[in-house]
Structure formats: structure tokens, C-alpha cells
Interface confidence: medium
């Protein structure tokens, strides 16, 4: 959080920013910033692999849900969107793109279809879907 | 947009931030920042007047929809939430808290109930509702 004092000295001018206010980011231009994570919702429908590649091309990854508190904005998201959660058949676990295992009680996993990829839906639900099915998707970039 | 060069001189250290990235805000702590507007979704149900007072107490106002482009994050919002749109019986117009008139084609107004207040619903819909009915609400703060 940058205080008004710091900003005043920075710009050598009067900028009255309450101490309870802060800048968020940095994020790619026109992305949503929340609790220093960056999110973007993409309208075009792509399969999971193409969605992943699209996020990669923007130096981001598909949505990773890691905290109901830090990501409570997600509870109000309408519709279904690819996230970075995949089923690893060899060990039966659900894991994120970065290799971390899905924490218990974070998502309610619902078998909508046979598949190894998951769609995010409101109120922290994950719908299993065939990875080849086109859907909209959410990219996420964690700031340092 | 603050370039990496500026940030380097600011902090006198290596901060590689692409020129296409930017900080958003300032916003109240833990609010959503998007295209330099600040939003917060409140879970507790209040009537329109209490919702307005709650936003005011945080130096904000109830949601004002002014641009489908600049506020396209709103199309994905689930459920119904009070916004700052009210019906003025004397002239029959819908106007925002700041007195500005609702621009044509911004919202599809749907008469859900008899009333003079409006709930925001996804895809830029406004549902007419009795102002005394408790609902969740969205506060908004426009940054300078």
C-alpha cells in the first residue's frame, strides 16, 4: 500500500490518497486486478489446450483456484469457463497446470461429462468436461 | 501506464514490468480494479437506501453503468444486485445517483416488480424492484 505521503514525494504534488487505498497489479492492460492477482475472461470458445495456449501467449496461465478468501470474486462468475485443473489418469489426482494438487474443500467437483479437464462455475464448482470441447476460459496472472 | 524504466528509477532496483502492463487504481483495499474503476460486491442483503448509505460510507456510490466496453466485466456477474439507478416518477426517466440520465441501449430494463429502484443482472440487464426489498449490492468508485 502506498501512502499519500509516499505518492506526494513521488510526484511532488498534492495527491490525497487515503492510507486504506492501494494500487493493484501490475497486470496486463485491461485485465481485472483483485488482491494483486490479474484475471481475464475470454469470450471466444476454445478447447482446453487452445485455451491454455492462449493464456500462455499472454504470459499467464489458466485460472488456478487456491483460496476462497483471496479469490472470492469468483463466487459471482456466471456460466462455465475452462480453468487450469486437469485429471491425471496415472495417479487419479486432480492437479493444476503448475503441478500442484487440488486442495481439499476448495472446489466441488461435479461430473458433467466424461473427461480429464475442468470448467469453473460460480460458487467454487468444477465441472468435469472432455478437454476437446470448446468453452470460454479464464486466464490468470499472479503478481509478484 | 508506468514503464519499467520509471519503476526502476522509483525503487532503484530491477523491476522488469513490460510496458503493456500497468497498475490499476487506487482503490479501497481488497476491491476489484478494472479499467481504473473500483468495484466491490457486498454479500449482505440491504434495501436500496441502506445499500446506498453503505457505499457512501466507503466514499463510493452504487454501481453506475456508463459503458458496455469499459465495464464488460459486468456481463459475467451472476445474480441480482442493487445498482444506483432509480426511477423519477415526476418525469418518468431512469437516472443515476449523480443525476445523469440512463443512456439508451446501455441496459435492458425488465419489470420484475412494481418499483422505482433497479437491480443489476448479468449481460447488462436492469430489473425493476421495490426499493424496500433487501438485496445484495455493488459499490463503485471511479478513480481520478
Amino acid at each position: 500500500i502506498w501512502s499519500a505521503v509516499f505518492l506526494n514525494s513521488l510526484f511532488n504534488q498534492e495527491v490525497q490518497i487515503p492510507l486504506t487505498e492501494s494500487y493493484c497489479g501490475p497486470c496486463p492492460k485491461n485485465w481485472i486486478c483483485y488482491k494483486n492477482n490479474c484475471y481475464q475472461f475470454f469470450d471466444e470458445s476454445k478447447n482446453w489446450y487452445e485455451s491454455q495456449a492462449s493464456c500462455m501467449s499472454q504470459n499467464a496461465s489458466l485460472l488456478k483456484v487456491y483460496s476462497k478468501e483471496d479469490q472470492d470474486l469468483l463466487k459471482l462468475v456466471k456460466s462455465y469457463h475452462w480453468m487450469g485443473l486437469v485429471h491425471i489418469p496415472t495417479n487419479g489426482s486432480w492437479q493444476w497446470e503448475d503441478g500442484s494438487i487440488l486442495s481439499p474443500n476448495l472446489l466441488t467437483i461435479i461430473e458433467m461429462q466424461k473427461g480429464d479437464c475442468a470448467l469453473y462455475a460460480s460458487s467454487f464448482k468444477g465441472y468435469i468436461e472432455n478437454c476437446s470441447t470448446p468453452n470460454t476460459y479464464i486466464c490468470m496472472q499472479r503478481t509478484v | 501506464i508506468w514503464s519499467a524504466v520509471f519503476l526502476n528509477s522509483l525503487f532503484n532496483q530491477e523491476v522488469q514490468i513490460p510496458l503493456t502492463e500497468s497498475y490499476c487504481g487506487p482503490c479501497p483495499k481488497n476491491w476489484i480494479c478494472y479499467k481504473n474503476n473500483c468495484y466491490q460486491f457486498f454479500d449482505e442483503s440491504k434495501n436500496w437506501y441502506e445499500s446506498q448509505a453503505s457505499c457512501m460510507s466507503q466514499n463510493a456510490s452504487l454501481l453506475k453503468v456508463y459503458s458496455k466496453e469499459d465495464q464488460d466485466l459486468l456481463k459475467l456477474v451472476k445474480s441480482y444486485h442493487w445498482m444506483g439507478l432509480v426511477h423519477i416518477p415526476t418525469n418518468g426517466s431512469w437516472q443515476w445517483e449523480d443525476g445523469s440520465i440512463l443512456s439508451p441501449n446501455l441496459l435492458t430494463i425488465i419489470e420484475m416488480q412494481k418499483g422505482d429502484c433497479a437491480l443489476y443482472a448479468s449481460s447488462f440487464k436492469g430489473y425493476i424492484e421495490n426499493c424496500s426489498t433487501p438485496n445484495t449490492y455493488i459499490c463503485m468508485q471511479r478513480t481520478v
Partner: antibody, heavy 123, light 107 residues
Framework: QLQLQESGPGLVKPSETLSLTCTVS??????????WVWIRQPPGKGLEWIGN???????YYNPSFKSRVIISVDTSKSQFSLKLNSVTAADTAVYYC???????????????WGQGTTVTVSS | DIQLTPSPSFLSASVGDRVTITCRAS??????LAWYQQKPGKAPKLLIS???TLQSGVPSRFSGSGSGTEFTLTISSLQPEDFATYYC?????????FGQGTKVEIK
């Protein structure tokens, strides 16, 4: 086992278009998780990623080539192609077509390579 | 773009030596780093990816370590067939980038 073979002219004149084709044999070119890649190596220098194409046709290009590169796929011929226009002497290189290793839904490098084809840009 | 800086650029060593090559990324790339070996006139060969996982058929004298921005390729006992150029590559985000390479020569 999967094999890749580049083909195309070895000599291209400056300002013209470099066109290369990669033929995939010993396996399918299309599938829900099939990506293909072009990489080049100028003489005596390092490797440079040009771009990827997904079997459905989605492409991802290196921004340093973006305005003049087109990668396409023809699943019926089991081929994918590279076109690089407005070439200069700096585009002289060995061009490789390749397949990234996609395992557990993430790229783990490039594990299948063509033998490479040398393209010289000269008048 | 994510830059990869290998060190050293050149390395003279003898058969049996332990050789270590490092690759530094300009930003954190988790474990999304691959190591390749390339011999003159040949296509590169994938040795290790992600970061520390040896690809099948690659001798166990090769090993990789690291995460984030600092990565290491180690050859525990250099063999005659290991004299080559070694490249690192990041696959965390597009554009995929390679380091400029480390040439391992016979001393």
C-alpha cells in the same frame, strides 16, 4: 514411430517468400492435443522459436516474426507449412519442424525433430 | 519476453570430469525449463524436462535441478560422446525462448 521431414527450396531471393513444408509420418497429425512447431538456427548461432500450430489451425507466433510469418496445417496431407515473407540475409538458417512433448497437459520441451533443412537467402 | 542466460558460453573439459552448466531466467518460470544437447549438423535432442526429469533413453550421468529463475545441468562424468552444445529453453510462456548455448569442448 513419429517422423518429420522438411522440404522446400534451399535458396530464396531477398524480399521473396520462404516456403517450407513438414510431412508427418508414423503417426497422426491431428488430435485434441496435437501441436506442431517451427524452430530455426542461423549458422553458428542459437535456436529461435518461430511459432506453433494446433491441429485445429490455431497459431502462436514469435512476435519478432509475427507480421511476416504464416504457419498452416493440412491434416488431409499430414503436413504443416511455414511461410516467411520479405526475407533478408538474416533469415538464412537451418529450419526445423518439430513436435512438442505434451504430457499431463503441459509442454515439456520438443522431443521429435525433423533433420532440418538449410535455407540460404541470397540473390 | 523471458530471457535465458547460460553460463559459461564455452567450457573446456576432459573425459571423466564433472561438468555443470547454469541457465538463469529473467523472470520466474517455475519448473518449465528444458535442456537439449546438439551435435554439429544434427537436430537438438531433448535431455531433461521439466527442470529435473530425465527423458527416457538419456544416460543417468545427466541430471538437472533448479526452479524459479536458476537452473543447472550437470554431467557427473563426461564421456567422449558428450562433447556438444547444450541449450536451455523456457516453456512457461510464449514466445518460447532458448539460451544462447554452452559449448562443451575437449580440453
Amino acid at each position: 514411430q513419429l517422423q518429420l521431414q522438411e522440404s522446400g527450396p534451399g535458396l530464396v531471393k531477398p524480399s521473396e517468400t520462404l516456403s517450407l513444408t513438414c510431412t508427418v509420418s508414423g503417426g497422426s497429425i491431428s488430435g485434441s492435443s496435437y501441436y506442431w512447431v517451427w524452430i530455426r538456427q542461423p549458422p553458428g548461432k542459437g535456436l529461435e522459436w518461430i511459432g506453433n500450430i494446433y491441429s485445429s489451425g490455431s497459431t502462436y507466433y514469435n512476435p519478432s516474426f509475427k507480421s511476416r510469418v504464416i504457419i498452416s496445417v493440412d491434416t488431409s496431407k499430414s503436413q504443416f507449412s511455414l511461410k516467411l515473407n520479405s526475407v533478408t540475409a538474416a533469415d538464412t538458417a537451418v529450419y526445423y519442424c518439430a513436435k512438442p512433448l505434451l504430457r499431463d497437459y503441459y509442454f515439456y520441451g520438443v522431443d521429435v525433430w525433423g533433420q532440418g533443412t538449410t535455407v540460404t537467402v541470397s540473390s | 519476453d523471458i530471457q535465458l542466460t547460460p553460463s559459461p558460453s564455452f567450457l573446456s573439459a576432459s573425459v571423466g570430469d564433472r561438468v555443470t552448466i547454469t541457465c538463469r531466467a529473467s523472470q520466474a518460470i517455475s519448473s518449465y525449463l528444458a535442456w537439449y544437447q546438439q551435435k554439429p549438423g544434427k537436430a537438438p535432442k531433448l535431455l531433461i524436462s521439466p527442470a529435473s526429469t530425465l527423458q527416457s533413453g538419456v544416460p543417468s550421468r545427466f541430471s538437472g535441478s533448479g526452479s524459479g529463475t536458476e537452473f543447472t545441468l550437470t554431467i557427473s562424468s563426461l564421456q567422449p560422446e558428450d562433447f556438444a552444445t547444450y541449450y536451455c529453453q523456457q516453456l512457461k510462456s510464449y514466445p518460447w525462448t532458448f539460451g544462447q548455448g554452452t559449448k562443451v569442448e575437449i580440453k
